[in-house]
Interface confidence: medium
């Protein structure tokens, strides 16, 4: 769960973030997993730790391996693992699959291609962009901040896009490249009767008394921008705001997410400090649009707690 795959090319900069997130003030210690040897924090080292970040300036093929990060909060040590692979530079133009970041889709209305992992680096604009190894030229292409905008997207714009930028560390410059595929989708929108993806109908959700619990109501309504679509939770047939239990709140801000081209909405129900009486309630996930309303019911059941919290036995 708290392991992350990272990769880079030899002689380029690679910066990896600890998969265990902590508050900015938390101390983070990095180790070579195999030897348990501490990674230095002094910036004069080629590989050094800097808080939540592990920096390879530049990376070497021999750096490949698993790195352990321990986020030290006042009481709890939370461990994460970064699985790092450094590859030799390819002589030809072809970018192998194992160097590709996640594919992004674009359409006539939305054609942003974000440069992967760039937020980890100290870079300055402009970015250089390449498609299938050719530098992008022409007024249709605009490098803006950390992304590329393509005007009047056509199906021929699909392909592999590489961003190249310079990372600066204490006055020294290091090159970084990252590649991802871009696909073009046809934006023909339509609306459907709501389909609730989660929770399942009559689902039983196990919760621990005294702990916090989250229930997610997730539904899809068709493709493209929807005129009217909403998801919400009800308790015993009553709106959350009218139910009057401050421990139980819906998370605001339903963001439309176009995954697989579908327009979907999420609403999270947060129950703080679960009590016995919460197990008696009926939780309804409602999804509605112009076609109508669909309802899935959830009930809570008690989960027997296992004492796995204490790190001191």
């Amino acid at each position: 769960k708290f392991s992350k795959q990272s990769w880079g090319l030899e002689n380029e900069a690679l910066i990896v973030r600890c998969p265990r997130q902590g508050k900015p003030s938390y101390t983070v210690d990095w180790y070579y997993s195999q030897t348990n040897k501490s990674i230095p924090t002094q910036e004069r080292n080629r590989v050094f730790a800097s808080g939540q970040l592990l920096k390879f300036l530049p990376a070497a093929v021999a750096d490949s391996g698993i790195y352990t990060c321990i986020v030290r909060s006042p009481t709890f040590n939370r461990t994460g693992y970064a699985n790092v692979t450094i590859y030799k530079k390819q002589s030809d133009c072809n970018v192998p699959d194992y160097l590709m970041y996640s594919t992004v889709s674009g359409s006539e209305k939305n054609s942003k291609i974000y440069c992967p992992t760039i937020d980890l680096y100290n870079w300055t604009a402009p970015l250089e962009w390449f498609k299938n190894c050719q530098a992008l030229q022409g007024s249709r292409y605009r490098a803006h901040k950390s992304f590329l905008v393509i005007d009047n997207v056509m199906t021929e714009d699909a392909g592999d896009y590489t961003c190249k930028f310079i990372h600066n560390e204490n006055g020294a410059n290091y090159s970084v490249t990252a590649t991802r595929s871009f696909t073009v989708k046809d934006e023909q929108g339509f609306s459907l009767f709501p389909v609730i993806g989660a929770p399942a109908q009559n689902e039983i959700k196990e919760v621990e008394i005294g702990k916090n619990a989250n229930l997610t109501c997730s539904a899809c309504f068709g493709k493209g921008t929807q005129f009217l679509a909403a998801v919400l939770w009800q308790l015993n047939g009553t709106k959350i705001t009218d139910f009057g239990e401050p421990r139980i709140q819906q998370e605001e801000g339903q963001n439309q997410s176009f995954s697989n081209g579908l327009a979907c909405l999420d609403m999270v129900l947060r129950i703080a400090d679960v009590k016995e009486e919460d197990l008696l309630l009926q939780y309804d996930c409602l999804a509605l649009n112009l076609h109508g309303l669909r309802r899935h019911t959830v009930r809570l059941s008690r989960k027997n707690p296992i004492d796995h919290h204490s790190i001191y036995c």
Partner: antibody
Framework: QVQLQQSGAELVRPGASVTLSCKAS????????MQWVKQTPVHGLEWIGA????????AYNQKFKGKATLTADKSSSTAYMELSSLTSEDSAVYYC???????????WGQGTSLTVSS | DVVMTQTAFSNPVTLGTSASISCRSS???????????LYWYLQKPGQSPQLLIY???NLASGVPDRFSSSGSGTDFTLRISRVEAEDVGVYYC?????????FGSGTKLEIK
């Protein structure tokens, strides 16, 4: 200004249970882990355990496992400690204390005096 | 558990002069990250403890610079350069290297 306001003094019978509260103000509740400390003339300051309001994680001193249960209510920014099966050995002043990474036990409540007597 | 050892009383000091309070831990408090997890607290009469020093040598916010701390991984000293009447109380050292966190028994600062 971070403040921790603890509940008032308690006088309880042996064998009973009691819940002490600690209400935080002046900061974001989830930014601090809540530590609980016992103070007696004989044993001095003893760490009971800690609760992370952000994750719900708890850690206990083995000595107080089964005796103390730590919880919190984020909506009211209040941490709780329940002490069960009380004996005269549990008579003490109990402190809650907020900790950040560098500042362990940075802020302290005023303490709650617990007396267990028949 | 890590045992923190303190003497119960300091040598009585005159106001305006310096005072030293010592503390010893049963194991090194030096973490592999280079931080020494040793803390000092002062409990004034009738009050809750308050943080003075964190990570062996860092002054907590609002603490006068008359206070300083030094030490190795196991032996530590808290120094007060010019003792004032308000410094009276019990000084506790504590370790936060590993669970359970442990405190010293406290050293009472006495004025001549």
């Amino acid at each position: 200004q971070v403040q921790l306001q603890q509940s008032g003094a308690e006088l309880v019978r042996p064998g009973a249970s009691v819940t002490l509260s600690c209400k935080a103000s002046g900061h974001i509740f989830t930014d601090y882990e809540m530590q609980w400390v016992k103070q007696t003339p004989v044993h001095g300051l003893e760490w009971i355990g800690a609760f992370d309001p952000e994750t719900g994680d708890t850690a206990y001193n083995q000595k107080f496992k089964g005796k103390a249960t730590l919880t919190a209510d984020k909506s009211s920014s209040t941490a709780y400690m329940e002490l069960s099966s009380l004996t005269s050995e549990d008579s003490a002043v109990y402190y809650c204390s907020g900790s950040t990474t560098d500042y362990y036990f940075a802020y302290w409540g005023q303490g709650t005096s617990l007396t267990v007597s028949s | 558990d890590v045992v923190m050892t303190q003497t119960a009383f300091s040598n009585p000091v005159t106001l305006g002069t310096s005072a030293s309070i010592s503390c010893r831990s049963s194991k090194s408090l030096l973490h592999s990250n280079g931080i020494i997890y040793l803390y000092w607290y002062l409990q004034k009469p009738g009050q809750s403890p308050q943080l003075l020093i964190y990570q062996m040598s860092n002054l907590a916010s609002g603490v006068p610079d008359r206070f300083s701390s030094s030490g190795s991984g196991t032996d530590f000293t808290l120094r007060i350069s010019r003792v004032e009447a308000e410094d009276v109380g019990v000084y506790y050292c504590a370790q936060n290297l590993e669970l359970p966190f442990t405190f010293g028994s406290g050293t009472k600062l006495e004025i001549k």
